[in-house]
């Protein structure tokens, strides 16, 4: 039993890091493998992650972490029984994938303006709370070409757009994702999408 693709990990910079790797053949990850991880810190304790299958030869493990900060560094040991298959390290702050924003809502009761709001996925005491920027994707269910991205570079988790920038009388969907420049993160996953019917009064034409 050998590791074909070494574990690569990403952190949500809050409580979970996800590591994925591939074995050289079909493997029952949960029964045959264990990923041990330990913070390189005084008084830290070793933890064991039981991996799940991710395709035939792929494995994935969700590492639970407390109080993630930039100085943290973890040792990782992948074991198959008594055999050490791989040894490595992981610094969560250097491999951040933010959590997806939640609670995306479209408020259509403001005159001729669409207000989209969503929730910041981090608590106020987390460093990323004040450093997320967002991308909002709006698309038409009827017209695949009607697809647009709005970049939200301010901190407030909201976006206002004129209803007239979208077609009237048809349904649209929106979703939002986040990233943080400070840690050069990847984009988060998209939030679940929300749907609304866009209708506004066309200005009277002479």
């Amino acid at each position: 039993m050998k590791v074909l693709q070494e574990p690569t990990c990403v952190s949500d910079y809050m409580s979970i890091s996800t590591c994925e790797w591939k074995m050289n053949g079909p493997t029952n990850c949960s029964t045959e493998l264990r990923l041990l991880y330990q913070l390189v810190f005084l008084l830290s304790e070793a933890h064991t992650c039981i991996p799940e299958n991710n395709g035939g030869a792929g494995c994935v493990c969700h590492l639970l972490m407390d109080d993630v900060v930039s100085a943290d560094n973890y040792t990782l040991d992948l074991w198959a029984g008594q055999q050490l298959l791989w040894k490595g390290s992981f610094k969560p702050s250097e491999h951040v994938k933010p959590r997806a924003p939640g609670n995306l809502t479209v408020h259509t009761n403001v005159s001729d303006t669409l207000l989209l709001t969503w929730s910041n996925p981090y608590p106020p005491d987390n460093y990323l709370y004040n450093h997320l920027t967002y991308a909002v994707n709006i698309w038409s269910e009827n017209d695949p070409a009607d697809f647009r991205i709005y970049n939200v570079t301010y901190l407030e988790p909201s976006l206002r757009i004129a209803a007239s920038t979208l077609k009237s009388g048809i349904s649209y969907r929106a979703r939002v994702r986040a990233w943080a420049q400070c840690y050069n993160t990847t984009w988060s996953e998209w939030s679940p999408s929300t749907k609304w019917h866009n209708s506004y009064r066309e200005p009277f034409e002479q």
Epitope: L42, E45, D67, V69, D125
Partner: antibody, heavy 116, light 111 residues
Framework: QVQLVQSGAEVKKPGASVKVSCKAS????????MHWARQAPGQGLEWMGI????????SYAQKFQGRVAMTRDTSTSTVYMELSSLRPEDTAVYYC?????????WGKGTLVTVSS | QSVLTQPPSVSAAPGQKVTISCSGG????????VSWYQQLPGTAPKLLIY???KRPSGVPDRFSGSKSGTSATLAITGLQTGDEADYYC????????????FGTGTKLTVL
Amino acid sequence: QVQLVQSGAEVKKPGASVKVSCKASGYAFTSYYMHWARQAPGQGLEWMGIINPRGGSTSYAQKFQGRVAMTRDTSTSTVYMELSSLRPEDTAVYYCARGKYWMYDWGKGTLVTVSS
Amino acid sequence: QSVLTQPPSVSAAPGQKVTISCSGGGSSIGNSYVSWYQQLPGTAPKLLIYDNNKRPSGVPDRFSGSKSGTSATLAITGLQTGDEADYYCGTWDTSPVWEWPFGTGTKLTVL
């Protein structure tokens, strides 16, 4: 919000022991290390030691080795710092502080006076 | 214990800028991150800067930190009378044993 509530002021005689408590609330108690530091009147801050509330393991500054003991009670989310063989120069305000590499939140402090 | 050295006192007028230095020999500052604490008269210390230059939520951007080599600096711009306090730098060291040294402390007076 995070709160670290410390026990009240103490007056002790030289040679005695003192046990200061620090009750934590507003966060997951076992997820954050706790430090203890002290500050003598008109002096600077001095680090004393650290405890991991999850397992209860501790590490102390060399200066206090053999004289200090840090413990915790997870059922009440409380950490304790006991200092023995007290001397007049141990007169200080003792602080608990939540954190790992740096101290995010501090208790208000407990004044311990050692006097004959 | 490792010793981090700060100037005993600094002073400046309201609205001015002031800097406080923190230097430490050995591996303490050079290999670690620096934090800064503000202690207003009669109160407990409060975290002002961590990770060399990051501010906790609620700390005004008038406070900033930097680090170069084995020394660190706290800068305060637009001084206010409410900034009058003692300021301490802090770090951690892992050699020969783990410890968390603090700086000697600096008294800031706003003239």
